[in-house]
Amino acid sequence: ILGGREAEAHARPYMASVQLNGAHLCGGVLVAEQWVLSAAHCLEDAADGKVQVLLGAHSLSQPEPSKRLYDVLRAVPHPDSQPDTIDHDLLLLQLSEKATLGPAVRPLPWQRVDRDVAPGTLCDVAGWGIVNHAGRRPDSLQHVLLPVLDRATCNRRTHHDGAITERLMCAESNRRDSCKGDSGGPLVCGGVLEGVVTSGSRVCGNRKKPGIYTRVASYAAWIDSVLA
C-alpha cells in the first residue's frame, strides 16, 4: 500500500495473507468460513510450492493469539483467467478446515448486486504489499482510502486505454495506491466487498495509471457455484 498507514490491529477480520513457502505472496479476503477469495495470477508461479492462508493476523512476524495458518485443500482459479490478461483475475482457496471465527477472524459480506460503485465513493484497500517504490515490505497490515474512478476516465488512452471492462473497476492512484503484494486483497466500500486487487505489473502511485480491481458482483454466479 502506497501513501497509506498502519491499519488498526484486527479491525479487518476478513483480511488474509496468501503465503507461498511461508512468505507473504498476496492478499486475500475471507468470504465464507472455509473460503478465501484472492487473485488468480497470484498462483501463476507457485508451481510446486506450498500455498497456505494466514488469518487473524496484523503482524506477519510477531506472535498474535488470533493468528492461524491454514493449509489449502483446493485452489480454484476462475476458468477464464489467463496469464497475459487482467480479466477474470479471481481465485478461490478452500481451507483445509473451517476457520475458527472470532473478533479477529470473520467473513466479509460481498456485493451481489451488479451495479457500478458511484465515482468518488471512498473505499478501503488493505494489504501487506510494498509501501514505497524501493520495494520495502511492511510487517504490519497497511490500509488506505481511495476514491472510485469512473470507468470512462480509466479507459482513456493515457490511463488504461480501453482495457477496463464492465467486470472491472478503478480507484484513483495519486500517490495513494495498492501495489505489488496487495494483489488479491479486498476493496471495501461501505462495509461490503466490492473489488479484488488485480495482480498485473502495473506502475503504482501514478495518477494516470489507476488501480484496477475485479468487481466481485460481476462474478457472483461463479463464486456461488464454487462455494456451493
Epitope: P119, R151, R157, T158, G162, A163, I164, V203, N206, K208
Partner: antibody
C-alpha cells in the same frame, strides 16, 4: 459489435444551427469517452473535443469552444454535437469516435454543408 | 498546441515497395506518465479512419505485420515493408499525449 452511427447532417445557411447525433451500440455507453472529429472536403482531420458520459465533463479544442456544445442522453446511448453560428468553413464530414482503445471505433461520418 | 508535420505530403509507389512516412512534433509528446501516445491512422476515400499503430510501435489487432511504427521524442516513422494494393490511402499521425490532441496533415500514398 461496437457501432457508432452519426446523423443530423445536411445543408444549413450561414449563421444557422444544427445538432448532430451519435448513437452508440455494442458496448456500455458510459464506459468510454466520446470524441468528435471533423474533416473539411479534401483536408485533414481536426479534433473538436470530447465528453465523459458519466460525469458530463467536456474538453474542447479552443477553436470550437464558443460555438459548439456537447451533450448526452445516456438512456439512449447517444452523444450530441450542437453547432451554432455556422460558417462556410464549418463545411465538413463530422465523426464521433470512442476513446479506448485509442480511436479504434469511428462512426461513418455525417456531412454538414454550410451555404446560402 | 502541438503541431505534427508529416513528410512527404504525398508519394507515388508501386506494389511491393517499401514506404516510409515521417511525423515530426513541435515539442516532445512524452506524457507525464512516461508513455508516448503517438498513433497512426489509415483513411480511404469516403471512409472513416482506421487505427493502425498506437503508442509509437504497437500494431492494433488485425493490422498486418507489414505496418510498423518507430521513433521517440519528436521524430516518428510509419513503415510499410511491402506495399499492397489495399494500402493506397492517406495516412495520418496523431498525438494523444497533450490536450488539444492533434493530427498531422496527412500523407497520401498513390499508385505510381
Amino acid at each position: 459489435e461496437v457501432q457508432l452511427v452519426e446523423s443530423g447532417g445536411g445543408l444549413v445557411q450561414p449563421g444557422g444551427s444544427l445538432r448532430l447525433s451519435c448513437a452508440a451500440s455494442g458496448y456500455k455507453f458510459t464506459s468510454y469517452y466520446m470524441n468528435w472529429v471533423r474533416q473539411a472536403p479534401g483536408k485533414g482531420l481536426e479534433w473538436i473535443g470530447d465528453i465523459n458520459p458519466v460525469t458530463g465533463d467536456t474538453d474542447y479544442n479552443a477553436d470550437f469552444k464558443r460555438r459548439f456544445t456537447f451533450s448526452l442522453d445516456t438512456s439512449k446511448s447517444t452523444a450530441y454535437l450542437q453547432m451554432n453560428s455556422l460558417r462556410a468553413e464549418d463545411t465538413a464530414v463530422y465523426y464521433c469516435t470512442r476513446e479506448g482503445p485509442s480511436f479504434a471505433y469511428w462512426g461513418q461520418g455525417t456531412l454538414v454543408t454550410v451555404s446560402s | 498546441d502541438i503541431q505534427l508535420t508529416q513528410s512527404p505530403s504525398s508519394l507515388s509507389a508501386s506494389v511491393g515497395d517499401r514506404v516510409t512516412i515521417t511525423c515530426r512534433s513541435s515539442q516532445t509528446i512524452v506524457h507525464s506518465n512516461g508513455d508516448t501516445y503517438l498513433e497512426w491512422y489509415q483513411q480511404k476515400p469516403g471512409k472513416a479512419p482506421n487505427l493502425l499503430i498506437y503508442k509509437v510501435s504497437n500494431r492494433f489487432s488485425g493490422v498486418p505485420s507489414r505496418f510498423s511504427g518507430s521513433g521517440s521524442g519528436t521524430d516518428f516513422t510509419l513503415t510499410i515493408s511491402s506495399l499492397q494494393p489495399e494500402d493506397f490511402a492517406t495516412y495520418y499521425c496523431f498525438q494523444g499525449s497533450h490536450v488539444p490532441v492533434t493530427f498531422g496533415q496527412g500523407t497520401k500514398v498513390e499508385i505510381k
